[in-house]
């Protein structure tokens, strides 16, 4: 039985050419972290496997940095990085846990942080 | 240049034991996972177990886990595979890989076998 | 844990072919996907890495395309040293698995 929960940044906003971190906190489960995958909306940006360590698509890897943790640092925003972002927890024995983090990049200087969730 | 040197292969018999090694060279071992891949004779390629850069998380094939470990010394930049109560499934050549699979050793044959 | 189906199993082209060998996931797994050469008595040497990125020295007639469970390795035109079995692998989710492999050979 899956007993964990994953608690996010939730809804968050930045500004355009400035830099946002995505960041996804799995609790209330014993289950081993095996690897974290970041995916935004159908894109694969990275992994961190817990043994291997970080893997950065060569498509993102210009504007996108790993950690802090298991979280992921977006950078350069435009406004096309405006979306759904994911954290996919594999562990074992539990299986997949799924984030959900929205980010919207903002043209002005009136982002302000959202609130945090949790997702069960 | 990256080097990678498997050895501690042989022929032990059902239960014995047996302990590989691999001796790293040409990059910083320290900063790199590390895995051991192997392959039975006329087969594809399996992957056995990893090991953290600094040592302190692992991880087993469920085929493995409970007879073998994985383990490194990062002063010799030496990386180990520890093999308990062997069996005849697990006679393969086995090889040692730096990171996400960009280098691989030249390997080390395990016969299991009475 | 995620199935790798390789195809064909084996080949036989000439020289100068292009040859086309697929492998499918049993599950999605966007683009983490590697391809290995093995050539016969060696190990395996890494030639592409997230589905269609070619590991550094490796000849450009090698690429690789796809994304999510189906995806090609492409020889654009087949030479003598091509003759090895490759190999797909997924790194999407632990255990990372490997395909069965494709062995080529020259007509």
């Known amino acids: 039985m899956m007993t964990g929960t994953i608690e996010t940044t939730g809804n968050i906003s930045a500004e355009k050419g400035g830099s946002i971190i995505l960041q996804c906190h799995l609790s209330s489960t014993t289950a081993q972290v095996t690897q974290v995958n970041w995916e935004q909306q159908d894109q694969l940006l990275a992994i961190c496997n817990a043994d291997l360590g970080w893997h950065i698509s060569p498509s993102f890897k210009d504007r996108v940095a790993p950690g802090p943790g298991l979280g992921l640092t977006l950078q350069s925003l435009t406004v096309n990085d405006t979306g759904e972002y994911f954290c996919i927890y594999h562990t074992y024995p539990d299986g997949t846990y799924t984030g959900r983090i929205f980010l919207e990049v903002l043209e002005s200087s009136v982002a302000e942080h959202g609130a945090r969730f949790q997702i069960p | 240049e990256v080097q990678l040197v498997e050895s501690g292969g042989g022929l032990v018999q059902p239960g014995g034991s047996l302990r590989l090694s691999c001796a790293a060279s040409g990059f910083t071992f320290s900063s790199y996972g590390m895995s051991w891949v192997r392959q039975a004779p006329g087969k594809g390629l399996e992957l056995v177990a990893t090991i953290k850069s600094s040592g302190g998380s692992t991880n087993l094939a469920d085929s493995v886990k409970g007879r073998f470990t994985i383990s490194r010394d990062n002063s010799k930049n030496t990386l180990y595979l520890q093999m308990n109560s062997l069996r005849a499934e697990d006679t393969a050549v086995y090889y040692c890989?730096?990171?996400?699979?960009?280098?691989w050793g030249q390997g080390t044959t395990v016969t299991v076998s009475s | 844990d995620i199935q790798m189906t390789q195809s064909p199993s084996s080949l036989s082209a000439s020289v100068g072919d292009r040859v086309t060998i697929t492998c499918r996931a049993s599950q999605d797994i966007k683009t983490a996907l590697a391809w290995y050469q093995q050539k016969p008595g060696k190990s395996p040497k890494l030639l592409i890495y997230w589905a269609s990125t070619r590991q550094s020295g490796v000849p450009s007639r090698f690429s690789g395309s796809g994304s999510g469970t189906d995806f090609t390795l492409t020889i654009s035109s087949l030479q003598p040293e091509d003759v090895a079995t490759y190999y797909c692998?997924?790194?999407?989710?632990?255990?990372?698995?490997f395909g069965g492999g494709t062995k080529v050979e020259i007509k």
């Open positions: 890989v730096r990171g996400y699979f960009d280098y």
């Open positions: 692998q997924q790194y999407y989710s632990t255990p990372y698995t």
